[in-house]
């Protein structure tokens, strides 16, 4: 077992709005949840895009998944990771 | 093999509380969901609500109320208690394991339910 | 809440016939769905999950297909193990929501 590096980012979105992407690599096996929650809550599926779970080359795979949120709210989202019977939460760098 | 069973009291007075054992084995209670289901005698099912890998929990608003998931990792027991029981909620009652990965979310494993009546 | 309706609650086939279920989303879900079997004495298992997908175990006779708000779970070759009740599930919002379900009996 190989754990994820996990690293969120943000970008500009639209005015007033940011897309934060939370991005894990270099784990294996492939099986990992990654995704958003606000306030402690799971957000619901509609509203996060994902990426599929792809080989990174070095026999290791590589995920992420975004979702758009309100400028001046970042302190309320985290990334939530499980893998291999680990768990970890990443909140937005302000 | 990964395998999830239901205890609980079978019958409970109006007003009192349910509380159900799932005891899993197979996975780790540390790294994987899981979400209680329940059935009312001849129909469909729904989703209560669910404890993730680090203990945090998703609930279905309309119970969020009367309804706490939580568990023991060292035992392998995840536990529903649910309040100010009335007599429709009377169903079976199912634990099942979640498996999440990105834009798949199922429950892949079952355990066989556990029958709850509420009567006086 | 998102609806999940199964307009038939209940069908009769032949053995090898080919059977199809259908479900509707009061809203698009975005391919969010999946298929459970549940037998008469009440096992749940999972049998389609994100539309199509199928479980490693689950025979190849049955496929799941559909968009936006319309799915269909398709068993291609009735078997008696068939005999079961049949429910869809989306989980494009919470709470996960499931069908009425539809019952398959054998004509």
């Known amino acids: 077992t190989v754990p994820p590096m996990v690293n969120v980012t943000r970008s500009e979105a639209s005015e007033g709005n940011i897309t934060v992407t939370c991005r894990a690599s270099g784990f294996y096996p492939w099986n990992i949840t990654l995704s958003w929650r606000q306030d402690g809550v799971s957000l619901s599926h509609d509203t996060q895009q994902w990426g599929d779970v792809l080989p990174d080359g070095n026999g290791t795979y590589q995920t992420w998944v975004a979702t758009r949120i309100c400028q001046g709210e970042e302190q309320r989202f985290t990334c939530y990771m499980e893998h291999s019977g680990n768990h970890s939460t990443h909140p937005v760098p302000s | 093999q990964v395998q999830l069973k239901e205890s609980g009291p079978g019958l409970v007075a109006p007003s009192q509380s349910l509380s159900i054992t799932c005891t899993v084995s197979g996975f780790s209670l540390n790294g994987q969901g899981v979400n209680w289901v329940r059935q009312p005698p001849g129909k469909g099912l729904e989703w209560l609500g669910m404890i993730w890998g680090d203990g945090s929990t998703d609930y279905n608003s309309a119970l969020k109320s009367r309804l706490s998931i939580s568990k023991d990792n060292s035992r392998s027991q995840v536990f529903l208690k649910m309040n100010s029981l009335q007599t429709d909620d009377t169903a079976r009652y199912y634990c099942?394991?979640?498996?999440?990965?990105?834009?798949?979310?199922?429950?892949?494993?079952w355990g066989a339910g556990t029958t709850v009546t509420v009567s006086s | 809440d998102i609806q999940m309706t199964q307009t038939t609650s209940s069908l009769s086939a032949s053995l090898g016939d080919r059977v199809t279920i259908s479900c509707s989303a009061s809203q698009n879900i975005n391919n969010y769905l999946n298929w459970y079997q549940q037998k008469p004495h009440g096992t749940v298992k999972l049998l389609i999950y994100y539309t199509s997908s199928l479980p490693s175990g689950v025979p190849s006779r049955f496929s799941g297909s559909g968009s936006g708000t319309d799915y269909s779970l398709t068993i291609s070759n009735l078997e008696p193990e068939d005999i079961a009740s049949y429910y869809c599930?989306?989980?494009?919002?919470?709470?996960?929501?499931f069908g009425g379900g539809t019952k398959v009996e054998i004509k």
């Open positions: 099942a394991r979640g498996a999440h990965y990105g834009k798949r979310w199922y429950f892949d494993v």
């Open positions: 599930q989306q989980y494009s919002k919470l709470p996960p929501t």
